[in-house]
């Protein structure tokens, strides 16, 4: 069939079809639907709403739509035994208790199954000794502590604040500087933004609030007792002891009201300087241990979680493309929430919903797209991305020959200033064309385009006229698609102001106030935001499914390879007499970039030039844009890190929500002048520039002309 | 409307228990703590006991430690006070009070105040 034949119309026509279907009404009545109660994974509640997607979706009109099932390792509290802290006097007895659930929000009280905050996979441990504070448990903080103030966190209980980087490499960094348990917190100087009233009055945390969260290190593995296989029927199971990325101490998180009483009494050292300090009326002591008259008192932890293979449903909707069906663009995003998941996820999954209504539509009217896409509402994304990763691990042979995209489509909103992108580089383009086609929500820019909006208020800090777009790290179900399999991602959704607001997320992020009411009275009444996002999600990936050629711009890819290679450059000569001893150069990777640039460049010629009309040509060039990022998949993956294979970006080691550029040698250099034994440690950077610069110049390769 | 009403005030002898209700109607208890407070004939008011919403903490008077326990039914929106080991300087009017801070985990200021029940300890 020829592609006109395909889609039944032009695509230009198509597209405008596609977006001009999607209504904010439609969004606003979905998110009302999917956050009337709890949506916990693996519970039944969350398994009801999976048959009802898949009924749905069905009714929309897509050509099937399964259910996809594994059994997981999940993790919960105990009902009858929960979990709380305690400041414990000296002959044992309690004075203080951390509260045991949440005051629930106006309208929810007699709601049922409301999981009480806690950290999932905690283990059991009933800990007691004295507090260190260690401001956000970053690997600097740490730093701080241990080298400069010289003090020990060895057997003591340390109390962190939520912010900066993911929960769990704040968990993994107390247990490597030796603590017996984590408490983490909500400082107000982070989840409470200045001038606006907390829920239910405003968007702000109230003191009684807790952000719930995992607290693994998967470093992409899935399921932590299958790690690079689906949990299947037959599926072989570690024993716990093997489990990957497990935490080994107890942890526990708790509201500010509970910090204070906490921190209040901490005595020892003073804080080191002021980005150590809160917005608490607290001292911000360090400690260790609390001051004078309290010196006795200790604080005591009471940790019963258990740890349970759970079974978790994906739901997989089918729209089979016409030209090339064995061609497949993903959009997924979760469907599995803390609580009522008001934004995260149901603010995502409303927009999915109506973009498959849309694409529904369509195909109803007689429309298929060019390739496949495949939509998928995925389970226990909260627990360490569980059901994409199964499901990708179940499904990695056809996916890695097939899949040209995925796109997210976790939480639609987490503000309503600007827009927020982070993708790979052959997708800019595809963004920077689509939001100058897409109209602003801004007020201020009414008549005036999406991305003339975004480049106003989040400028690119290199190139002037253009948008910031960030590097995709990790924290969502892109995760497997992108590290592991090197399939092109990408994400978006509205964002705050990045520049008044400081504080880390969204202030309600994870707790029970994230309902339905805080996005309808407080972000997004019109649910215009919502619908520009799903503008931009769904029309991505109507470009991506529909496009002759492939919407990838490889040229792109080059120039972000050489800034790249010039950061990392510069990080290693900070080190210059180590580089000069060791021998350590980077002439080959600048010499793999510049080919990389100069065979993008003649690619992207013949692209220009190419027979759209044979339909041989059309695939090979198709697939050489489609293969790209594959190529920079090294099979054996990253030190350490198995399952991030991407050689060019990776999840930070420190902050597993941001993303790396040439991970390998970043880590290969952190902190390199500590190492004991620097000649190994150097030989490892060398190693490190060798496996990049090679893989740049294979992935380079891949675009010549192929005879 | 908000409001809170007292029941099972009495007289009885010293030595003997009572147990005072404090029915919440117009808001929920579950998101709040709550307080006894205790007025004896002639005198001012005197704090007698603090829960929080979530029944983790409780906080009395030193005049009545181990001998009233407060307790709440968040589910029948109630709250409880079982008073034993009664004796003649416990003899006042019985006041509930809501406490003014949504989670508050310590004993703050009142906002919402009953009408109150009495109580006589007497031979």
């Known amino acids: 069939k020829s592609s006109n034949e395909a889609t039944n119309i032009t695509p230009k026509h198509n597209m405008k079809a596609f977006l001009d279907e999607l209504k904010a009404e439609n969004i606003k009545k979905f998110l009302y639907n999917f956050t009337q109660i709890p949506h916990l994974a693996g519970t039944e509640q969350n398994f009801q709403l999976a048959k009802q997607i898949q009924s749905q979706w069905k009714e929309f009109g897509l050509d099937s739509v399964e259910l996809a099932h594994y059994d997981v390792l999940l993790s919960y509290p105990n009902k009858t035994h929960p979990n709380y802290i305690s400041i414990i006097n000296e002959d044992g007895n309690e004075i203080f208790n951390t509260s045991l659930f949440e005051p629930p929000p106006p309208g929810y009280e007699n709601v049922s199954d409301i999981v009480p905050p806690f950290s999932a996979f905690s283990p059991q441990g009933m800990p007691e000794g004295d507090l260190v504070y260690v401001n956000y448990a970053r690997t600097e903080d740490f730093f701080k502590l241990e080298r400069d103030m010289k003090i020990n966190c060895s057997g003591k209980i340390v109390i962190a604040r939520y912010g900066k980087v993911f929960r769990g490499n704040k968990v993994k960094n107390a247990q490597l500087a030796g603590a017996k348990g984590v408490i983490l917190y909500s400082d107000p100087a982070d989840y409470f933004a200045p001038g606006v009233k907390s829920y239910p009055d405003g968007w702000n945390l109230p003191g009684g609030g807790v952000q719930r969260g995992n607290i693994l290190n998967l470093n992409g593995a899935g399921d932590p007792l299958t790690p690079g296989y689906p949990a299947n029927e037959y599926a072989y199971r570690r024993g716990i002891a093997e489990a990957v990325g497990l935490p080994s101490i107890p942890v526990h998180p708790i509201g500010y009201y509970d910090a204070q009483k906490l921190l209040e009494k901490m005595g020892g050292s003073a804080p080191p300087d002021s980005s150590w300090r809160g917005s608490l009326k607290v001292p911000y002591n360090v400690g260790p241990g609390f001051t004078g008259n309290f010196s006795t008192q200790k604080v005591k932890m009471h940790i019963h979680s258990t740890n349970e293979v759970t079974r978790i449903y994906n739901v997989i909707g089918t729209l089979r493309g016409a030209v090339e069906p064995d061609r497949y663009v993903i959009l997924g995003g979760h469907r599995d929430s803390w609580v009522f998941g008001g934004i995260d996820p149901q603010s995502g999954a409303a927009v999915v919903h109506e973009i498959v209504r849309s694409f529904g539509t369509l195909k109803k009217e007689g429309w298929r797209p060019r390739r496949t896409i495949l939509f998928a509402s995925w389970d226990a994304e909260e627990f360490g991305l569980l059901g994409s990763t199964e499901w990708a691990e179940e499904n990695s042979r056809l996916l890695q020959e097939r899949g040209v995209a995925y796109i997210n489509a976790d939480s639609s909103i987490e503000g309503n200033y600007t827009l927020r992108v982070d993708c790979t580089p052959l997708m800019y383009s595809l963004v920077h064309n689509l939001t100058k086609e897409l109209k602003s929500p801004d007020e201020g820019f009414e008549g005036k385009s999406l991305y003339e909006s975004w480049t106003k208020k989040s400028p690119s800090p290199e190139f002037s006229g253009m948008p910031r777009i960030s590097k995709l790290g990790s924290g969502n179900d892109f995760e497997v698609f992108f590290q592991r399999l090197g399939i092109a991602s990408g994400r978006a959704r509205y964002t705050k102001n990045w520049e008044t607001n400081k504080f880390s997320g969204y202030p309600l992020y994870h707790s029970v106030y994230e309902t339905y009411e805080l996005v309808e009275k407080f972000y997004d009444p019109m649910f215009k935001y919502h619908l520009t996002v799903a503008q931009v999600r769904g029309g991505m990936v109507f470009e991506l499914a529909n496009s002759i050629v492939l919407p990838f711009d490889c040229r792109d890819y080059a120039v972000v390879l050489r800034k790249y290679a010039d950061k990392i450059y510069s990080i290693s000569m900070k080190h210059p007499q180590e580089m000069k001893t060791y021998s350590v150069s980077f002439d080959s990777l600048f010499s793999a970039v510049k080919n990389f640039t100069e065979i993008a460049s003649k690619f992207s010629e013949r692209l220009q030039d190419f027979d759209k009309s044979n339909p041989i040509v059309l695939r090979m060039m198709n697939d050489q844009l489609m293969f790209l990022e594959r190529a920079f998949i090294d099979p054996l993956g990253l030190p350490d890190r198995p399952f991030y294979r991407h050689v060019i970006y990776a999840p930070s080691s420190h902050n597993k929500y941001a993303g790396e550029s040439f991970p390998g040698i970043y880590d290969a250099l952190f902190d390199i002048e500590s190492k004991v034994d620097p000649s190994k440690a150097w030989g490892e950077v060398k190693r490190q520039i060798y496996v990049a610069a090679f893989t740049v110049q294979a992935a380079a390769e891949t675009l010549s002309e192929v005879a | 409307q908000v409001q809170l009403v007292e029941s099972g005030g009495g007289v009885v002898q010293p030595g003997r228990s009572l147990r005072l209700s404090c029915a919440a109607s117009?808001?929920?208890?579950?998101?709040?703590?709550m307080h006894w407070v205790r007025q004896a004939p002639g005198k001012g008011l005197e704090w007698v006991a603090f829960?929080?919403?979530?029944?983790?903490?409780?906080y009395y008077a030193d005049a009545v430690k181990g001998r009233f326990t407060i307790s709440r039914d968040n589910s029948k929106n109630t709250l409880y006070l079982q008073m034993n080991s009664l004796r003649a300087e416990d003899t006042a009017v019985y006041y509930c009070?809501?406490?003014?801070?949504?989670?508050?985990?310590?004993?703050?200021?009142?906002?919402?105040w009953g009408q109150g029940t009495m109580v006589t300890v007497s031979s």
């Open positions: 009070a809501r406490d003014r801070i949504v989670g508050g985990r310590v004993p703050d200021a009142f906002d919402i």
């Open positions: 117009g808001f929920p208890l579950i998101s709040y703590g």
């Open positions: 829960m929080t919403y979530d029944g983790s903490n409780r």
